[in-house]
């Protein structure tokens, strides 16, 4: 009885993300293994989030756009071992807006989701960021080795986007 | 004061090349990103070409790409416009315009006076 | 690419009196709190002149008559009171995205 209170739970829970999300890709976990993490198909997933890259090229706001009309922001990179599994699925010869801008020119970068931007945990390729006007970042492939780069935002670039993993 | 003269522009044939130049003074010329934007005859103002400050980024609309090369020469205060193929629909006068970063745009704060290119058999 | 419609394409307005210009954007020309459209003024045989940019942030030395406003993707440009002087072309421009583009232009008349 218990199971399939949780079943028809799940199923309406579904029901309710898929006007939002066609597909969705679901896996088991918790420690009895009743939980399921989902994420959009063909969204990837690492941690508590998935991850989406757009190879439409698009100005840093209108991939913000395009990720929020998703439900998600551009991608908000908090620990290495996340960058890393980030470029695992990333073309070395592109570059991909990450969710960090500096509106004002003034070095303050802020990530679009408001989480703290600690210069202690940033990527940067060498001299980088270095001009006032380049006021959005990017990922991109350079020196043997994947780090950030500060880019005009209207120019356009293909992006990430990265949510909350969807619990049922 | 901040001054921007082009020069250059002249009378052509169709599939002609030119250079249009650009002097820029009483600013600090290396520290701008700059760019090139024409009026038509029937006065309607179109983007031609962009170059970042620190000559890393170019851009170009479609309508002149792989026909025209904007470049600029910091030493000599210079921005430079190489139009090849010209079409008669390239007719024009020809301004440069320094670029201010606002947010996560940019406006034109100067303009030169403009130097016209007419395109004509 | 992002098109800018201007309107009226001229207006005659009495000395004193307000000029109102419209300019509206096949796309959103704003994000969050940046509203990214700006106004030139051009007068015959003249280049452009920055009047306001981001939208409502008048440039400096032009004078407070001039006001801006809006955001996403309809805006306008706003002349009170109208003087002699203000009699020209005014053009919207947007650069959030790659092509930078121009409204068609507004041509002010004073009465």
């Known amino acids: 009885n218990f199971m399939y209170s949780k079943t028809v739970k799940r199923l309406s829970k579904l029901q309710e993300y898929q006007q939002y999300y066609p597909s969705l890709t679901c896996v088991m976990e918790g420690k009895d293994m009743e939980d399921w993490s989902c994420c959009p198909t063909p969204w990837t997933s690492f941690q508590s989030s998935c991850y989406f890259i757009s190879t439409v090229m698009q100005s840093w706001t209108k991939s913000q756009n395009n990720c929020s009309v998703m439900g998600a922001d551009l991608v908000v990179i908090n620990t290495k071992e996340e960058q890393d599994f980030i470029t695992q699925n990333l073309k070395i010869n592109s570059a991909y807006f990450l969710g960090l801008s500096d509106p004002k020119g003034w070095r303050h970068w802020q990530w679009v989701d408001q989480t703290p931007y600690n210069k202690n945990v940033t990527f940067w390729h060498s001299g980088e960021p270095n001009s006032p006007d380049e006021r959005c970042a990017i990922i991109n492939f350079r020196s043997e080795e994947w780090g950030w780069n500060d880019v005009h935002c209207h120019v356009p670039q293909k992006s990430i986007c990265k949510m909350k993993k969807i619990y049922i | 004061e901040v001054q921007m003269v082009e020069s250059g522009g002249d009378l052509v044939k169709p599939g002609d090349s030119l250079k249009l130049s650009c002097a820029a003074s009483?600013?600090?010329?290396?520290?701008?990103?700059m760019s090139w934007v024409r009026q038509t005859p029937d006065k309607r103002l179109e983007w031609v070409a962009t170059i970042s400050s620190g000559d890393s980024y170019t851009y170009y609309p479609d309508s002149v790409k792989g026909r025209f090369t904007i470049s600029r020469d910091n030493a000599k205060n210079t921005l430079y416009l190489q139009m090849s193929s010209l079409k008669s629909e390239d007719t024009a006068l020809y301004y440069c315009a320094r670029q201010i970063y606002y947010d996560y745009a940019y406006y034109f704060d100067f303009w030169g006076q403009g130097t016209t290119l007419t395109v004509s058999s | 690419d992002i098109v800018l419609t201007q309107s009226p394409a001229s207006l005659a307005v009495s000395l004193g009196q307000r000029a109102t210009i419209s300019c509206r954007a096949s796309?959103?020309?704003?994000?969050?709190?940046?509203?990214?459209m700006h106004w030139y003024q051009q007068k015959p045989g003249q280049p452009p002149k920055l009047l306001i940019y981001g939208a409502s942030n008048l440039e400096s030395g032009v004078p407070a008559r001039f006001s801006g406003s809006g955001s996403e993707t309809d805006f306008t440009l706003n002349i009170h009171p109208v003087e002699e002087e203000d009699a020209a072309a005014y053009f919207c421009q947007q650069s959030i995205e790659d092509p930078p583009t121009f409204g068609g232009g507004t041509k002010l008349e004073i009465k």
């Open positions: 009483g600013f600090t010329f290396r520290s701008y990103g």
């Open positions: 796309e959103s020309v704003s994000f969050r709190t940046s509203h990214l």
